[in-house]
């Protein structure tokens, strides 16, 4: 295709004179205009024909071939596809055609998004054809291999486009190019129709890769750096395949200076040093090819930052709490620099930040330095504290940020029982958080084990960490290398910087949480009523273990006494406890014995089975209520008790055995099952009876007799009994004795409501006792019965029964209740008694 | 059927004298404490006094101790409330009641007493 | 002394609705508390005592429920005879005695 004109990336001009009959081809006129600069700012070949050397005398049945004209090349191409035989009328004014000869600008370029070229057909303003409508066609071709094609293609090879010429003589001509052949060359030329006349443009070769204009640079922005440069920075537009240099203009205007400057850079930003407050910068972009041929991109949007009149850099600082930083600051009042010397600064607005602080830059910045920062505390809506810059005493309302934040985040790790995963904890509670702050964990692994120091590396890998519902983040590392040295921290991501907390190195081996003892069991040992805990020791890990066991009264909230284990070997432990009877709850868990690692969780709890341990350690407390005629014979006596409580019972009673024994009939035994009551007839002089516990190991050793005597009904030792209501909770009964010669066992009180249909309360007492404090609820201005009963060893003796309190000394009694009570006042015992433990005594 | 019939009330000056008494029938009158529980009008019920069933006990509320003095006479099942040193507030109904319950089971319809100047 | 307090003050009901008073005391009674009618012009009369038991001759669709500080009066079926004034008293510490301040049952 040496036949062909190769477009340039500029601008260049298609010259068209009417054709000389002698020649096959026209003869190119000699003069070729040098290379000049357009307007704005292209480059333009032009080729024009000195057509006073030219006559002719019709236009008509014509087709004009133009030429472009290079130094090198004197030939003109002709376009394959040229139409012959075609008859047109001209209507063109000949001689201005013969003066000028008729001229169009073209420019041809790849757009931005790679996908169409484009060429620009513009009549050149002294075109005799200037004011006719044409028509403009591109007909073109993209060969499969050009080295096997030395001629021109042939006729019917070229595909044509039509150009559309709606806009201000300016015809647009689209050729669309495939990805796969933006390196391939593209074969064209133009056929302008105008005023009746066709002119046909030599053949054009192109390839599209190097006549690529760029869509403008994006998002121009300007920012003043923390070293107080102007920076400007913009993007490259999006698809171009190669690197771009770029041309950025700007100017500077403030009160004092105006600067304009022109550079170009192949980086994406440029550095603008010198930097003034109360200026404004103006600044565009444009792009173009890097390395090979390619057009200038339009200029970008114009894009204005103005800088305040007072200069902070950096604006704002994130620091951890220790840390050293410093601002800088330029300040400019009423159209003056301050100096450096005369600027103070302030923390707040309140606190004068000292000089000693300060450094002088340069004349007009100033700098200020904060040392071993604390953390900032917020106050109320603002998490920063505020830098003032100010003029001596004339703080401008502008100021920098400072956020110093505890970066001090605890991260705890254990490695699950089976040695699979170790999962990390780490929470957000301890610091102050930050709008617009993100956190992660970082981490890297050492092939074995921890350094003395842990330290943050450059090279790391973030770990997903996932909120928990109790505020902590958690992170799983799995599979793991039980060996190597996980060193790990929290790094703070910030629109203003990113912070980390300090490093932790973590051994997957040394945080080891086991899983907990299996099969735990809990009993108390029948007979010695110790309680004994086994278990198995869990398969991870290896090492020796130590356990703990913890152990309990079975309830809601138990109260947990502790034990340990340290030998390793141990599978079981007993251990004294002060209730046989009761449901005690045991859970086990362990930890490695040489300290490193966790305790496990604690075991399913077991818990301890109440069965007998022992026969019950006595029968129970009973009293009697003797129904019937008193001075017959024969009396029903109901006899009543307490169900045995179980640490008594060791620990249940399965049924209870009333063993009687009279002179006449004997000794007998009555079965009365688990019922807390029983009847008989009383017919002899002295019947005894006690009453037997039984449980599943045997019968209650020590019990309580009871014998029902005529002769002893009628022994008379209680002199006087009297009752003293202390409050609505408590009355003193208090009695006196006569000498008697009889064994004195114990005492029974009875006392009842005799306004209500209630029960008779009883209760057994130390025979020592001269006074007791009964508590219940009394009403007193109503009328109890209160009875005290000797109890022998030959039988129950006469009762004193009182329907009243006493009169006398009530006050005197109630004063008591202000005083400590000794034991000798109250013959060697103060028995308290709760109503839950009247109510055992209840009869209905 | 338990009755109680409360006499004596009368319009005083304030710092004069009052006793109240109550006739008990249909029940055996020493088998039960007494009380009196007063009412002003409008008001909701006041317990002013009690006394056991022998007269062996008496209480009452702060705002009567020491100017008035329950008192009983088993022989005449009858109950007494001496009042003295009245005050504009001991204005009231008077209920005497049988004590059950640690409260009253039968109440007596009640006489005015009204202490005025 | 042992303060009571019952609520509502007042209420009012219609024949045939289920009415509830309850009363509190300041600290706990126990079980110790009674409940009494009083319709106007007329001797107070016992309806519940100790919280729960009612007294003969009182119907049963009064009935009372509630131990240690809370404690309701539940009439489970309103009759027109029922509209009085209604008082608990405790007896848990005596003395002295205290009432409630009462709560008077109004016809709808």
């Known amino acids: 295709f040496n036949l062909s004109y190769p477009i340039t990336p500029w601008r260049f001009k298609l010259s068209c004179m009417p054709p000389n009959s002698t020649y096959d081809y026209f003869l190119l006129p000699a003069g070729l205009s040098k290379n000049t600069s357009n307007l704005n700012g292209h480059y333009e070949t032009a080729v024009e024909f000195n057509s006073s050397d030219t006559h002719f005398s019709n236009l008509s049945k014509t087709t004009f071939h133009c030429c472009f004209r290079s130094e090198q090349d004197r030939n003109c191409s002709l376009c394959a596809d040229n139409i012959e035989g075609k008859t047109f009328v001209s209507t063109v004014n000949s001689s201005v055609f013969q003066q000028m000869g008729a001229n169009w600008n073209i420019q041809c370029w790849l757009k931005g998004d790679l996908k169409l070229f484009i060429c620009y057909v513009e009549s050149l303003f002294k075109n005799p054809f200037k004011n006719y409508k044409h028509k403009v066609h591109l007909l073109y071709v993209l060969p499969e291999v050009l080295e096997d094609s030395p001629l021109v293609p042939q006729k019917g090879s070229f595909q044509m486009v039509h150009c559309n010429c709606s806009v201000h003589e300016r015809c647009e001509c689209l050729v669309p190019v495939p990805t796969a052949k933006l390196n391939d060359t593209l074969l064209m030329c133009l056929k302008i129709t105008s005023g009746g006349v066709i002119f046909q443009s030599p053949l054009m070769s192109v390839q599209p890769i190097n006549m690529v204009k760029p869509d403008p640079p994006l998002g121009l922005r300007m920012e003043i750096t923390d070293d107080g440069n102007l920076k400007i920075s913009w993007s490259s537009p999006p698809l171009v395949p190669f690197p771009l240099q770029y041309e950025v203009k700007y100017s500077e205007n403030s009160t004092t200076v105006i600067r304009e400057a022109d550079k170009i850079v192949s980086a994406t930003s440029l550095l603008v040093d010198g930097i003034l407050p109360g200026s404004s910068y103006e600044v565009q972009v444009r792009g173009k090819r890097l390395d090979g041929p390619g057009i200038w991109s339009d200029w970008s949007t114009p894009h204005v930052f103005t800088t305040q009149d007072v200069i902070y850099f950096p604006p704002k600082i994130l620091t951890s709490v220790g840390s050293n930083v410093s601002f800088h600051c330029i300040y400019k009042n009423e159209n003056k620099i301050v100096s450096s010397k005369k600027i103070v600064w302030w923390m707040n607005l309140a606190e004068k930040i000292p000089q000693s602080q300060y450094d002088v830059v340069s004349d007009h910045v100033s700098k200020v330095t904060f040392f071993n920062l604390n953390e900032t505390k917020p106050r109320g809506k603002f998490t920063y504290d505020a830098v003032y810059c100010c003029n001596e005493h004339e703080c401008h309302h502008r100021y920098a940020e400072l956020y110093v934040i505890d970066v001090n985040i605890n991260i705890s790790c254990e490695t699950d029982g089976h040695l699979t995963k170790m999962t990390c904890r780490w929470s957000t509670n301890t610091i102050q958080s930050l709008a617009g702050s993100t956190l992660q964990l970082r981490y890297r692994r050492s092939s074995l084990y921890c350094f003395d120091i842990p330290s943050i590396h450059p090279i790391s890998k973030p770990k997903d960490c996932y909120l928990q519902s109790d505020g902590f983040y958690e992170c799983v590392f799995q599979p793991i290398f039980l060996l190597s040295g996980y060193t790990m921290w929290i790094r703070i991501n910030h629109p203003l910087g990113s912070l980390d907390s300090p490093p932790t190195c973590v051994l997957p081996d040394s945080v080891v949480k086991p899983l907990p003892p299996s099969s735990v069991k809990a009993e108390i040992i029948k007979n010695i009523g110790l309680l004994k805990i086994s278990w198995e020791k869990p398969v991870f890990p290896e090492n020796n273990l130590q356990f703990q066991i913890r152990y309990g009264l079975s309830g809601k909230e138990i109260q947990w006494k502790m034990y340990d284990v340290y030998d390793a070997k141990s599978k079981s432990v007993s251990l004294p406890v002060p209730d046989f009877c009761a449901v005690y709850a045991v859970q086990v868990r362990c930890k490695r014995s040489d300290g490193l690692g966790l305790w496990s969780n604690w075991s399913n709890p077991a818990y301890t089975v109440v069965m007998d341990i022992k026969v019950p350690m006595r029968g129970p407390e009973f009293w009697r209520i003797i129904n019937g005629d008193t001075m017959k014979k024969e009396k029903n006596v109901t006899l009543l008790w307490k169900p045995l409580m179980k640490n008594d019972s060791l620990c249940s009673v399965q049924r209870y055995v009333i063993n009687h024994h009279t002179s006449c009939n004997g000794t007998w035994s009555e079965d009365v099952g688990n019922h807390t009551k029983f009847t008989f007839l009383w017919t002899e002089q002295a019947h005894t009876v006690t009453v037997l516990a039984i449980n599943s190991i045997g019968a209650s050793v020590a019990n309580f007799n009871l014998t029902f005597s005529w002769p002893m009904s009628k022994v008379n030792i209680v002199q006087s009994l009297s009752a003293y209501p202390l409050n609505s909770s408590c009355v003193i009964l208090s009695w006196i004795l006569s000498p008697s010669d009889y064994k004195l066992m114990y005492f029974i009180i009875e006392w009842k409501n005799l306004n209500e249909d209630g029960e008779i309360k009883w209760l057994r007492i130390s025979s020592s006792v001269k006074k007791y404090y009964i508590h219940d609820h009394f009403i007193p201005i109503e009328k109890y019965q209160f009875s005290l009963y000797p109890i022998f060893m030959e039988g129950v003796g006469k009762p004193k029964i009182i329907n009243s309190f006493a009169q006398d000394n009530t006050e005197k009694h109630q004063n008591d209740e202000q005083k400590l009570i000794s034991e000798e006042d109250l013959g060697g015992e103060q028995k308290l008694i709760s109503e839950e433990d009247l109510h055992h005594h209840h009869h209905h | 059927e338990v009755q109680l019939v409360e006499s004596g009330g009368s319009v005083v000056r304030p710092g004069e004298s009052l006793r109240l008494s109550c006739a008990a029938s249909?029940?055996?009158?020493?088998?039960?404490?007494m009380s009196w529980v007063r009412q002003a009008p409008g008001k909701g019920l006041e317990w002013v006094s009690g006394?056991?069933?022998?007269?062996?006990?008496?209480v009452y509320a702060d705002s009567v101790k020491g100017r008035f003095t329950v008192s009983r006479d088993n022989a005449k099942n009858s109950l007494y409330l001496q009042m003295n040193s009245l005050r504009a507030e001991d204005t009231a109904l008077y209920h005497c009641?049988?004590?059950?319950?640690?409260?009253?089971?039968?109440w007596g319809q009640g006489t005015l007493v009204t202490v005025s100047s | 002394d042992i303060q009571m307090t019952q609520s509502p003050s007042s209420l009012s009901a219609s024949v045939g609705d289920r009415v509830t008073i309850t009363c509190r005391a300041s600290?706990?009674?126990?079980?110790?508390l009674n409940w009494y009618q009083q319709k106007p012009g007329k001797a107070p009369k016992l309806l519940i005592y100790?919280?729960?038991s009612l007294q003969s001759g009182v119907p049963s669709r009064f009935s009372g429920s509630g131990s240690g500080t809370d404690f309701t009066l539940t009439i489970s079926s309103l009759q027109p005879e029922d509209f009085a004034t209604y008082y608990c008293?405790?007896?848990?510490?005596?003395?002295?005695?205290?009432f409630g301040q009462g709560t008077r049952l109004e016809i709808k």
């Open positions: 009641a049988r004590a059950r319950y640690g409260g009253a089971d039968y």
């Open positions: 249909g029940f055996t009158f020493d088998d039960y404490g």
């Open positions: 006394i056991s069933w022998n007269g062996g006990i008496t």
């Open positions: 600290q706990s009674i126990s079980s110790y």
């Open positions: 100790a919280a729960s």
């Open positions: 008293q405790q007896s848990y510490s005596t003395p002295p005695i205290t």
